[in-house]
Every structure is written in C-alpha cells, then in structure tokens.
C-alpha cells in the first residue's frame, strides 16, 4: 500500500470550502479499507483531533465542530479518500492526515500530510487620530484590523489631488500608523487607509481638521 | 439650517468653460470638517460626483473627471466654485453643490437645488 | 455608466412594503456599506441614511437600511403616496476613490 505524495499545503478562504487530497495505491481488494483523517490544529497543537472515520464499510462522524461540514469527496470504499470541508473556520487551520490500513496489504507508506490554511480578509479598520491637532502639533493617524490572515498590511493616503501624504508624514505600513509632525492647515482634510492582505482589502475614511488658534483679546 | 445655493449662466457654448459658484448660508465654510462637493445629474439619469474642496483649499477630484475640472473655495464670501473646461453636449447636467462631513460618514446630507447647465451653440 | 447597480422602477401597492436593492462590490458596498438619496421630482436629493442603517434626524421611522455582501436594500413599509419618488445609493468606493450612485429606482406608489 503506498499513498500518494500531496501537496504540501492548502490555502482556502474563510466560508469557502476546501478539498484535502489523499490517494494510494493497494494490492489487495478495498474490502477491508479503514481510513482516519486526523488534523492537529494550529490553535491547539497538542490536541489533535478525530475529522472523520471510514471503517467496516461505514462512515463516522469525528470532532462535533466537523459535524455536517465534513465528508469523503467519492463514494466509498475507494483509491480516492480525499476529504472536503465546507465553510471553513479560522480553527480548521493545521495540518492534516491521512491515515489508510487495506488489509492485507501492510508496508509501504500508509500516511499523507496536508497543511491546510484558512485565509480571512481584512476586518474593517478603525481609523482613530492620536494626539492634538492644533497647528504646529504632531499627530498620529492610527489604522487597524481586528482580523485578517495573513496580517493585513496599511496604506495611508490624503483624499487630495496628489493622493500623497503631507512631505512632513511618515508611514508604517505594518504597523498601520501615519506620523504627521508639525501639522499646519494644508494637513487637514480626508485620508483614507487601505488595510489589504492576499484575499482582500478594507478600508476606512478619516478627518483631519487642524486648529488654528484663536486670536486672544488683550485688554 | 444649513443652505446651499447655486449660481451661473444656464447656458454654455460648446469648447468653452463651466463656472458656477455656491454659496452657503447658515454655517460657516470656515469651520472645518466639511467637504464642500460639486455633483451633476445628466437629463433623465444618475449622478456623478464631480470633487470636494476643503476650507483650507484642498481639492480632490472625481479621477475621470480631474483633468477638466477646477474647484475653489472663497471663505470670505463663503462660497465655492466649479469650473469645467472644455465642455461638450454630454455635459448638459443638473449640477448640485452638496456637503458631505463625518457626522454623516462622509455622504452629502446638504443639497443645493441645483441649476441647469446646457451646453449648446 | 453608474458604478451601483439598481433595478430602473419598480411598482407597489398603498400599504404595502417596498424593497429596494443596490448591488455594489467589495470595493464599495461590500466595504463601506451605503448610503440612500430620495428625490421627488424637480427636487434635489435628501439623505435617508448612510452607512446602512443610520440616519439623520427626522426620517421617516418606516425606513429601514440594511447590507448583504455586496448588496443594500432599503425597506419601506406602509406605502404613502409620497414615497413616490427615485431612490439613489451612493456608497465611497475605496478602489476608485470616488463616490459612486446607482443609476436610481423609480418607485411608483399604485
């Protein structure tokens, strides 16, 4: 019994379903097949964990949160005991195997590996600004995801003509921030940030309104 | 109350130059934190979004529309103003200056009641 | 050519409950959520809501704004005759980075 060699790695995006491959070829009729698919997750490595079971001609349920997400691609018994899950979870990221025993055919390579990665699109961003904006200040305009895999990265830019940051601005695209030094009323106006990541882009509006100070009455 | 009116020749000759001007009542152009926008309405159709000023003469135009358009901004009198160079006959509109601001996350909630452009020799 | 798509008309009975539909993409509806514009005849827009459900003050309570994916809706119940009117949707698209409307619904009131 040999299975096939699999690709190492799936990546799917979340609520979208996901085939994990796993063939073999056997010597001996499929009358005594027993297939396990296990996963380790990412999120719990020391935990792994049954997904289904196909044993005596019969199918089984595993883990209760694989529940009516998870069955055998063909029908059983086959060479082909591909798996698919539908609406993929950010939990079902790990790695996962393919456990095939056809008795009497014992030797050879009996397991296949798949590493499955559940992609999420970037959350919509909060856009806040960190400290004063009266003119001559330094600000910060601050952009965040909640969620998104892999890690979004940030662009800033001024709803302008230019699309471009004022010259005194600095960006960290990681990190989500703008630095604006010395702002003067030419930094206000509309930036909007672009969280992106491979699967997706998000984005949120923000306002700047530079304060000028008031004249004082002397007297 | 906030009130937005428009002003400027009804008519335009075909190659020539759009001006309108809006003037604002009620509220101060002056007092930051609102895009004071130009859209038009084509006869029978949709809008379109032409650009925004802010206070501080920052101008950000509508992409298919930038190369043709200049708008600018007159605190003083408080009013703003539309200029569309180059016009042909698919720029007979309703033109609308609108205000959009954060409160309303950032979509024109003041309207003007809009005048008519033809453009025709 | 409009960067929202709406349905051009749509015809519902005094009473009833009006669905209106404004299908975007990720880039706007899909990001940003919508806003909705009514304009009566020879009258220029009014502000419904804006970023689905939120309103100014003095909309009428038989509004409701609401988003799928992709798509907005605005409900309106209990039909009077004044809800004649065009329905715009408006939404910030991030990609082209400008707003966008739907081509307008023109809602009849039988």
């Known amino acids: 019994l040999e299975v096939s060699e699999s690709p190492g790695s799936i990546q799917v995006a979340r609520g979208q379903p996901a085939v994990l491959p796993c063939t073999f070829t056997t010597s001996a009729a499929l009358i005594n097949l027993n297939v396990i698919w296990m996963v380790t997750p990412l999120s719990n490595a020391n935990q792994p964990e049954q997904v289904i079971l196909y044993q005596g001609g019969q199918m089984f349920d595993g883990a209760p949160r694989f529940h009516g997400r998870v069955g055998f691609t063909g029908t059983m018994p086959a060479t082909n005991v591909s798996i698919f899950i539908n609406n993929t979870q950010l939990s079902d990221t790990g790695t996962y195997q393919c456990l095939v025993n056809n008795l009497p055919d014992i030797g050879g390579r009996n397991i296949g590996v798949t590493g499955l990665t559940v992609l999420v699109p970037p959350s919509a961003p909060h856009c806040q600004i960190q400290g004063s904006q009266d003119i001559g200040s330094d600000v910060i305009l601050l952009c965040s995801s909640e969620e998104g895999i892999p890690r979004p990265t940030y662009l800033w830019e001024k709803l302008d003509n230019t699309l471009k940051l004022p010259p005194t601005a600095t960006q960290d695209q990681v990190q989500g921030t703008v630095t604006i030094r010395n702002i003067s009323a030419l930094s206000s106006g509309l930036y909007q940030c672009v969280a992106s990541n491979a699967i997706g882009t998000s984005t949120c509006l923000l306002d700047l309104q530079v304060i000028s100070p008031q004249p004082r009455n002397i007297g | 109350e906030v009130q937005l009116l428009e002003s400027g020749p009804g008519l335009v000759k075909p190659s020539q130059t759009l001006s309108l001007t809006c003037t604002v009542s009620g509220g101060s152009i002056s007092s930051g934190g609102y895009y004071w926008s130009w859209i038009r309405q084509h006869p029978g159709k949709g809008l379109e979004w032409i650009g925004y000023?802010?206070?501080?003469?920052?101008?950000y135009y509508n992409p298919s529309l930038k190369s043709r358009v200049t708008i600018s901004v007159d605190t003083s009198k408080n009013q703003f103003s539309l200029k569309l160079s180059s016009v042909t006959a698919a720029d007979t509109a309703v033109y609308y200056c609108?205000?959009?601001?954060?409160?309303?996350?950032?979509?024109?909630?003041?309207w003007g009641q809009g005048t008519l452009v033809t453009v025709s020799s | 050519q409009p960067g929202l798509t709406q349905p051009p008309s749509m015809s519902y009975g005094l009473g009833q409950t009006a669905t209106l539909t404004c299908t975007g993409n990720r880039n706007n509806i899909g990001d940003q959520g919508a806003a909705w514009l009514q304009q009566h005849q020879g009258h220029p827009p009014k502000l419904l809501s804006y970023?689905?459900?939120n309103g100014p003050s003095g909309i009428s309570e038989r509004l409701s704004a609401s988003r799928s994916g992709n798509t907005a809706s605005l409900t309106i119940s209990g039909l009077q005759p004044e809800d004649e009117a065009d329905y715009y949707c408006s939404a910030w698209d991030s990609s082209l980075r400008a707003w966008v409307f739907g081509g307008g619904t023109k809602l009849t009131v039988l």
């Open positions: 970023r689905n459900n």
């Open positions: 000023i802010y206070y501080s003469g920052s101008t």
């Open positions: 609108a205000r959009a601001s954060r409160s309303t996350d950032y979509y024109f909630d003041y």
